[in-house]
Structure formats: C-alpha cells, structure tokens
C-alpha cells in the first residue's frame, strides 16, 4: 500500500513539476525591467526565451518574437535547449510511469517489469528536473552579470548633457516557476525511485514441501523468486519447480487485492 502511495504521489508531483516546466518555458517573464531605484517609466519591458514584450502604461502590450536563431546569445540557446530536453524527458517519463503505476494493470505485466519502468521514469524525472533547474540557473546567472554591468554604467552621458535611461533587468516570475517546477519534478523522480525498490519482488522463502513420485523424488527449492531490477532488463521471473504439486504460497498471485487501491 505504501509503495503504491509513494509511486502515485511521485507521479502526481512529477506531473505538476513537468506542467510547471512547460509553463515556465512558455512564459514571457523570464527577465523583467528593474523598477527599483529607476526612473518611473511609462513603459515596462520584459523578456522570455522566445520573445520580448513591452507593456505601456496605456495598457497596450506589444510582443516581438526572436526571429533569428544565429543572432541570439549562446547562453539563451543553451537555456532553451536545457528546458526543451527537460520537457521531452519529463513527457517520456510521464508516459512510462503511467504504465508503471501499480494501480493500473496492463495484461499480465509482472511486478519486476513495473519496477523497471518505475525506476526508468524516476531517473527521467530526476534528469528532467535537473535540466530545468540548470536552465533557469544559467539564465539567472546571466541576468545577475548583466544587471551589475548595467548598474556600473546606469547613466551614460553624452558630453554630460544628455542622459540615457539604462534598462536593467531582474528576475522574472518564470524563473521562480522554473525553479519550483524543477524541484518538484526532481522530488517526484526520487519518490518514483524509492517506490521502485518496494515494487521489486523480494526473495520469498517458500515452505519446503516434498513428495514421492514414481521412480524419483523432487523437492521444491526455497527462494524460487529471483528479483530482477536491472535497468531495462527483460528477464522473466519463473518459479523453479518440476512437478504438479503446489503449496499454498504458490497460488497464482494476480489479480491480488493489493493491486487495486
């Protein structure tokens, strides 16, 4: 039960996290005009990964896409790449984890296969979360560097007569959304990995039962289950017996009452 709860919670947390990563990637407010200690402008500038926007105090907002690929800073391209990789990995992870959920039964999928899938999705979520956190952090670092550079020459005078307002940018809402979402995806991934350990069938001690058949004797070997938690392993777990007799422990295990929550 605890395993199912952990897996389910991990899935939900990761789902929220990935939705957040997608939202952050699409948001326009990665960097916003710094209003502190600045002249009160009637224009508010903010920028995203894909376009920059200007909101006038009149209420009119104009956004322009970055229609160039080569002309963009390498750091921005890197952030885009990290966020997209995070989304793709997260989406695949979600797909895999849906089939890995203990509360969903697909055909005669064994627990070991579900354990593998849970681990796979968990690792994908962890990497997805790390990609998002890395992307947002790289962008934040870029902002901090640019902020102090523009603060150094806040006003550039032309012969000391004319002043130019230097637009400084600070952290936008998307950065915080990205950090939180990345963290949630990471936590969800860790929960999935923890759930995987519980899903993996432990070595079960079966009662040694023997009977005499004509001509030769067969004994059940205790510990007939061999757990397979190898990443991507396709090994089938079979009970090792040779004969028709069954112990009470060996009654077919699916569908069990524990498979439905």
């Amino acid at each position: 039960m605890a395993v199912t709860a952990c897996q389910g919670l991990g899935f939900v947390v990761s789902l929220i996290g990935i939705a957040g990563i997608i939202a952050a990637t699409c948001m326009d407010q990665w960097s916003t005009q710094d209003l502190y200690n600045n002249p009160v402008t009637a224009v508010f500038n903010y920028q995203g990964l894909w376009r920059s926007c200007v909101r006038e105090s009149s209420g009119f907002t104009e956004c322009r896409g970055y229609f160039t690929l080569l002309g963009l800073p390498a750091m921005l391209q890197a952030v885009r790449a990290l966020m997209i990789v995070g989304i793709v990995l997260g989406a695949i992870g979600l797909l895999v984890s849906i089939f890995a959920l203990k509360c969903i039964r697909i055909g005669s999928m064994e627990d070991s296969a579900k354990a593998n899938m849970t681990l796979t999705s968990g690792i994908m979520f962890i990497v997805s979360g790390l990609c998002a956190i890395a992307g947002v952090s790289v962008f934040a670092n870029m902002l901090v560097t640019n902020f102090w550079m523009s603060t150094a020459n806040m006003y550039t005078g032309m012969g000391g007569m004319v002043q130019t307002v230097q637009t400084r940018y600070t952290f936008g809402a998307a950065l915080f959304v990205g950090w939180v979402a990345g963290g949630l995806t990471l936590i969800g991934g860790v929960m999935m990995c923890i759930a995987c350990r519980g899903l993996a069938p432990e070595e079960t001690n079966y009662k040694a039962v023997s009977y005499h058949a004509s001509g030769h004797s067969v004994a059940y070997k205790p510990g007939g289950f061999k757990a397979s938690t190898g990443f991507g392993s396709n090994t089938k777990n079979k009970k090792i017996y040779d004969g028709g007799a069954r112990t009470e422990d060996e009654v077919q295990s699916y569908p069990s009452k524990h498979d439905y929550v």
Partner: antibody, heavy 118, light 113 residues
Framework: QVQLVESGGGLVKPGGSLRLSCAAS????????MSWIRQAPGKGLEWVAT????????YYLDSVKGRFTISRDNAKNSLYLQMNSLRAEDTAVYYC???????????WGQGTLVTVSS | DIVMTQSPGTLSLSPGERATLSCRSS????????????LTWYQQKPGQAPRLLIY???TRESGIPDRFSGSGSGTDFTLTISRLEPEDFAVYYC?????????FGQGTKLEIK
C-alpha cells in the same frame, strides 16, 4: 464615437476643494488608462495625473502629489479628480484624456475651467 | 524630470510652404525593449482641446493627413508639415511619454505670414 465630457469645474477659494468628473463613452473604458491634463490661461499644456488599467498604478505631477487624487468608476464609465488644498496656480482648464498607443493622449474632452481665487 | 524644449517659439509661414518644428528632450526617449521613441506631437487650435497627430515619434494617428510626418530618435525630434494648409496654423506641442511626469514642450506657434 468616442466621447469624453468633463464637469465639476468652477470658482473656488484658495485652500478649498473641488471634484472633477469625466464621463466616457464609445470605447472600452475599463481597459483604458486615463489622464488629467491642465492648461493655465494663455499657457502651455501640463500633465497632472494618470491612472493605469485595473487601478494598478496612479502617477501624479510632483506639485499636486498629496493634494489631488485620481480615481475611476468602471461601472459608471467615469474618471474623477479630487482636488484639495487648491492654490491660485491650479487655475486652469482641466482636460480628461484617454491614453492610447505610445502612451499618447488620443482622445480629449472639451475641458472644464477651474478658477482658484479669493 | 525630463525637460522638453521646442523651437522656434513662433514660426511665420505662408500656406503651401514647408514647416519644420523641432523638439529636444533632456533625456533619451528611446525604449531599448522595442526600439521605439516615446515622443508625441499634438496640435491645438484656440478654444479647442489638443488633437493627437503623431505618436512613437513617427507614427501618424489615424485620420491625420499624410502631409504631417514625424522623425528623429533619442533626444532630437522633428515634426514636418510638407505643404501648409490654412487649417494647419495652430500651436504644436511635443510630449515625453516615456518617463513620468509626462512633460510637454512649451509649444511652437505656427502663424500665417
């Protein structure tokens, strides 16, 4: 068509109060930033105050800050300017205007005269 | 505060002539975010409310004749009336629409010679 009609002007003694109103029609008032601009007799234009969309921000000319208050009632499509502690230098024709692209005042009312005199 | 300086104070011309009105701001009105200059030109006739002519320094308001054109960037701006019509004789104001307070120039009076 767009119409802005100011009212509430008149003669008032120094230190007195007055409330100007601006009735708007012909456009989406609630999603428009609105401003008050004044013009002293024989002088140039002077911006007084602006209220942005959704009551988010209000901006004032330094000389009127603390004395004048801009407000709006979207249900009534009306803009107001509450003027307290009036001075002789506040004597002017007060115009209400809508802000459009480029924060430019694209539509203006006909103006209302405020005279501050003892 | 941004100081807007208009020149000349008065311009005397005849109908059909070309009018060039100048406006200078003490600070740049160019917004780096969209590369637009937040300068506006208005026309005011005696006893009337001002009328918007040009915004973003060079964009003509709808309904404004194409003889009116705006140019300039940063701190220096110009309003040009290519061929003066009798109805163009009025007072012209430029306005900073970039930084509060939204200051106006003192105006240029365009009169018939």
């Amino acid at each position: 068509q767009v119409q802005l009609v100011e009212s509430g002007g008149g003669l008032v003694k120094p230190g007195g109060s007055l409330r100007l109103s601006c009735a708007a029609s012909g456009f989406a008032f609630s999603s428009s930033a609105m401003s008050w601009i004044r013009q002293a007799p024989g002088k140039g234009l002077e911006w007084v105050a602006t209220m942005t969309v959704g009551y988010i921000y209000t901006y004032y000319l330094d000389s009127v800050k603390g004395r004048f208050t801009i407000s709006r009632d979207n249900a009534k499509n009306s803009l107001y300017l509450q003027m307290n502690s009036l001075r002789a230098e506040d004597t002017a024709v007060y115009y209400c205007a809508r802000q459009g692209y480029g924060n430019a005042m694209d539509y203006w009312g006909q103006g209302t005269l405020v005279t501050v005199s003892s | 505060d941004i100081v807007m300086t208009q020149s000349p104070g008065t311009l005397s011309l005849s109908p059909g002539e070309r009018a060039t009105l100048s406006c200078r701001s003490s600070q740049s009105l160019l917004n780096s975010g969209n590369q637009k200059n937040y300068l506006t030109w208005y026309q005011q006739k005696p006893g009337q409310a001002p009328r918007l002519l040009i915004y973003w320094a060079s964009t003509r308001e709808s309904g404004i004749p194409d003889r009116f054109s705006g140019s300039g960037s940063g701190t220096d701006f110009t309003l040009t009336i290519s061929r003066l019509e009798p109805e163009d004789f009025a007072v012209y104001y430029c306005q900073n629409n970039y930084i509060y307070p939204l200051t106006f120039g003192q105006g240029t009076k365009l009169e018939i010679k």
